[in-house]
């Protein structure tokens, strides 16, 4: 079942997805699509990376993190109710049926009417018991080569479900880890 994330109309929504490159520079193509992950590729692609750059995107969708180190979390700017639904983050690991697929459910709530102005919360989420992948820190040197055979090792799952949307930023440190290589 999908992990659920929430944002209010007019906010930016944050959908986390991470992977660990096998070696510095061995980046893996990633696609984000609206709708559950199909057997191959992403349906209704909103953003795509190749082995080096973001090479396709539609307006309001971007990668705010360090995607070259595996943080391929999607930011959706200024969301509306129409942005509700399932999103697919697909790590396109070379080889037959090697892709890692993550379905994330985005729930958009109407903007709260508050009597006094409050600080806007950009990123909101709930239930971060999810299988994401985590990037690693910067490397001093680089050796780019062919991607090796890839093993996926799931490391550590997370504890408590965070139901309070104000803890969304903590979500960046949550989830399981997928290492490639």
């Amino acid at each position: 079942s999908e992990v659920e994330y929430r944002a209010e109309v007019g906010q930016n929504a944050y959908l986390p997805c991470f992977y660990t490159p096998a070696a510095p520079g061995n980046l893996v193509p990633v696609c984000w699509g609206k709708g559950a992950c199909p057997v191959f590729e992403c349906g209704n692609v909103v953003l795509r990376t190749d082995e080096r750059d973001v090479n396709y995107w539609t307006s309001r969708y971007w990668l705010n993190g360090d995607f070259r180190k595996g943080d391929v979390s999607l930011t959706i700017e200024n969301v509306t109710l129409a942005d509700s639904g399932i999103y697919c983050c697909r790590i396109q690991i070379p080889g037959i049926m090697n892709d890692e697929k993550f379905n994330l459910k985005l729930v958009i709530k109407p903007a709260k009417v508050t009597p006094a102005p409050t600080r806007q919360r950009d990123f909101t989420a709930a239930f971060p018991r999810m299988l994401t992948t985590r990037g690693h820190g910067p490397a001093e040197t680089q050796t780019l080569g062919s991607l090796p055979d890839i093993n996926l090792t799931q490391i550590s799952t997370l504890a408590n479900e965070l139901r309070d949307s104000r803890l969304a930023n903590d979500l960046r440190d949550s989830g399981a880890t997928i290492r490639i290589g």
Partner: antibody, heavy 120, light 107 residues
Framework: QVQLVQSGAEVKKPGASVKVSCKAS????????MDWVRQAPGQGLEWLGY????????SYNQKFKGRVTMTTDKSTSTAYMELRSLRSDDTAVYYC?????????????WGQGTTVTVSS | DIVMTQSPDSLAVSLGERVTINCKAS??????VAWYQQKPGQSPKLLIY???NRYTGVPDRFSGSGSGTDFTLTISSLQAEDVAVYYC?????????FGQGTKLEIK
């Protein structure tokens, strides 16, 4: 030390093609991308595309797609950029530049530039 | 394509003074902005990458800051050898794009 040495200046007629070479030394050629950037007289910088010598993968600026081809010869550590159907507004200095993961694929070493003049 | 807009187009500053050059992206590019220096008749040189990382051998009077859509190159104390044109570049998406350049002169 890292060096990128480009071929000499070219004068071409409209409709012709030009092939610029860039010989790399001082590093492992296949470990880095080679980007190509041009600069028209008195103008700014414009990215044409890149090639990854390790596997021959390329990415071209859509503006030049169909007119530009980038290749490499690993045996001589040389990159090539061919631009076809030349027009007068292709008159520019063409640079090759190395880019790699360590600097987030920014261009840390540049060739000296090759002046291409397109004139009838 | 992402449009990078620099300001100002040119500026004249006294030696020893602080210099600030701005660059605005037409959409968020995270931290994926680089700065280059190009002196007359020379190839560009990389100064800053990933918004704030100084490239090897670049004097520490050069610094970069910003994220999202707004970025700044700062020269803390202008030296005579800093006279050049400065370009920002987004290295987030393909095609990579550059600002139009800022020409820096001595007042």
């Amino acid at each position: 030390q890292v060096q990128l040495v480009q071929s000499g200046a070219e004068v071409k007629k409209p409709g012709a093609s030009v092939k610029v070479s860039c010989k790399a030394s001082g590093y492992t050629f296949t470990d880095y991308y080679m980007d190509w950037v041009r600069q028209a007289p008195g103008q700014g910088l414009e990215w044409l595309g890149y090639i990854y010598p390790n596997n021959g993968g390329t990415s071209y600026n859509q503006k030049f797609k169909g007119r530009v081809t980038m290749t490499t010869d690993k045996s001589t550590s040389t990159a090539y950029m061919e631009l076809r159907s030349l027009r007068s507004d292709d008159t520019a200095v063409y640079y090759c530049a190395r880019s790699g993961y360590g600097n987030y694929y920014t261009m840390d070493y540049w060739g000296q530039g090759t002046t291409v003049t397109v004139s009838s | 394509d992402i449009v990078m807009t620099q300001s100002p187009d040119s500026l004249a500053v006294s030696l020893g003074e602080r210099v600030t050059i701005n660059c605005k992206a037409s959409q968020s590019v995270g931290n994926n902005v680089a700065w280059y220096q190009q002196k007359p008749g020379q190839s560009p040189k990389l100064l800053i990458y990933y918004a704030s990382n100084r490239y090897t051998g670049v004097p520490d009077r050069f610094s970069g800051s910003g994220s999202g859509t707004d970025f700044t190159l700062t020269i803390s104390s202008l030296q005579a050898e800093d006279v050049a044109v400065y370009y920002c570049q987004q290295h987030y998406s393909s095609p990579s794009t550059f600002g139009q350049g800022t020409k820096l002169e001595i007042k």
